[in-house]
């Protein structure tokens, strides 16, 4: 739409149990989900480790001008773009009881808008045209949500390019430590 944008800052959203949608039927049984060994793996593990913070849903604050044809807002508006990767459930200790996360594949969570706000903007037009008022819908907050058939890809595109773009070589585990030792650290992080 030909608007200027520059990043101001970013807020990290680290999901908690309450932020998740209701568990699917197979997730009701949590007989082994409270196992402490859900954190990092020992150094011998064949995979590189990365910091937990790399797997979070971030609110990136952007300032942009709203445009409508040749008209442009008198003042820029600040809005959020949801960015980042919602890591596997194993990184979310509070959510461990919610799923059979020992499976090789499971619920797909995406960083998407949670709440919106409406803002009235005044558009200035060239050629002496009278200013016009317009209401715009802006993202107010982001959240990790389970992907469902209702979240189609065209909808995801509005959530910021990160949601659909492959992330280069990120690994979902905290730094290599014994799994048991790492649990307390993870719980503090969330």
């Amino acid at each position: 739409q030909g608007w200027q944008a520059f990043k101001n800052d970013a807020t990290e959203i680290i999901p908690e149990l309450g932020e998740y949608p209701e568990p699917p039927p197979e997730l009701e049984n949590n007989k082994t989900m409270n196992r402490a060994e859900n954190g990092g793996r020992p150094p011998h593990h064949p995979f590189e480790t990365k910091d937990v913070s790399e797997y979070s849903c971030r609110e990136l604050h952007f300032t942009r001008y709203v445009t409508d044809g040749p008209c442009r807002s008198a003042k820029p508006v600040t809005e959020l773009v949801c960015s980042g990767q919602c890591g596997p459930a194993r990184l979310l200790p509070n959510a461990i009881g919610r799923g059979k996360w020992w499976r090789p594949s499971g619920p797909d969570f995406r960083c998407i808008p949670d709440r919106y706000r409406a803002q009235r903007v005044q558009l200035l037009c060239p050629g002496g045209e009278a200013p016009r008022a317009r209401k715009v819908r802006l993202v107010a907050s982001c959240k990790c949500k389970r992907l469902t058939r209702f979240h189609n890809q065209s909808e995801l595109k509005d959530f910021g390019t990160e949601a659909a773009r492959p992330q280069k070589g990120r690994k979902p585990r905290p730094r290599a430590r014994s799994a048991k030792a790492n649990q307390a650290e993870l719980e503090n992080a969330y």
């Epitope: 060994e37 990184l91 499976r103």
Partner: antibody, heavy 119, light 111 residues
Framework: EVQLVESGGGLVQPGRSLRLSCAAS????????LHWVRQAPGKGLEWVSG????????DYADSVKGRFTISRDNAKNSLYLQMNSLRVEDTALYYC????????????WGQGTTVTVSS | QSVLTQPPSASGTPGQRVTISCSGS????????VNWYQQLPGTAPKLLIY???QRPSGVPDRFSGSKSGTSASLAISGLQSEDEADYYC???????????FGGGTKLTVLG
Amino acid sequence: EVQLVESGGGLVQPGRSLRLSCAASGFTFDDYALHWVRQAPGKGLEWVSGINWEGDDIDYADSVKGRFTISRDNAKNSLYLQMNSLRVEDTALYYCAGNSRGYGGLDVWGQGTTVTVSS
Amino acid sequence: QSVLTQPPSASGTPGQRVTISCSGSSSNIGRNTVNWYQQLPGTAPKLLIYSNNQRPSGVPDRFSGSKSGTSASLAISGLQSEDEADYYCAAWDDNLESYVFGGGTKLTVLG
């Protein structure tokens, strides 16, 4: 070195039983959920069964439900697949595989053991 | 017939970019993460991509995964002769309560 080694395959008649074993080394065994995946000659991969770290949460493919039983012995670093009422269509190369990362794919594989069901 | 649908074959010349598709439904790819495996001739499968687009360490960044709706794809750029293998996509299926694989795609590197 992370290693899974399968054994117990062989030629068996339809209706008979066979027990496959998978011995693990080079990693902390109970850090891994374990699975059996099979591949019929010239065909693709088919997941058979999976078991969590402690051995008390198990999943089976519909094709083997009620006939196959997966189990593990963490003290012996071993995974097992008890196959009963074998059918000709169970003929395949059986792989033992593991995943250490939640929802993170099967990151460790054995080389497989061949099961042939034929009369 | 496989729950996840892949083209049986794909080909490319060295240096080219090749994409392999994997089509599923709302009960598997539509809701769950997708993994990709590479099986070189006569060897066991190897995890190539997990959680839609994550690469295990040791997997070259020429391999990338993506997911859109009920489909996923694996892209291989800068194709090399050693990439000649069978490639499988896989995902958990909520209805079948099973980990399902695609039928596999045989990739041939020409020339």
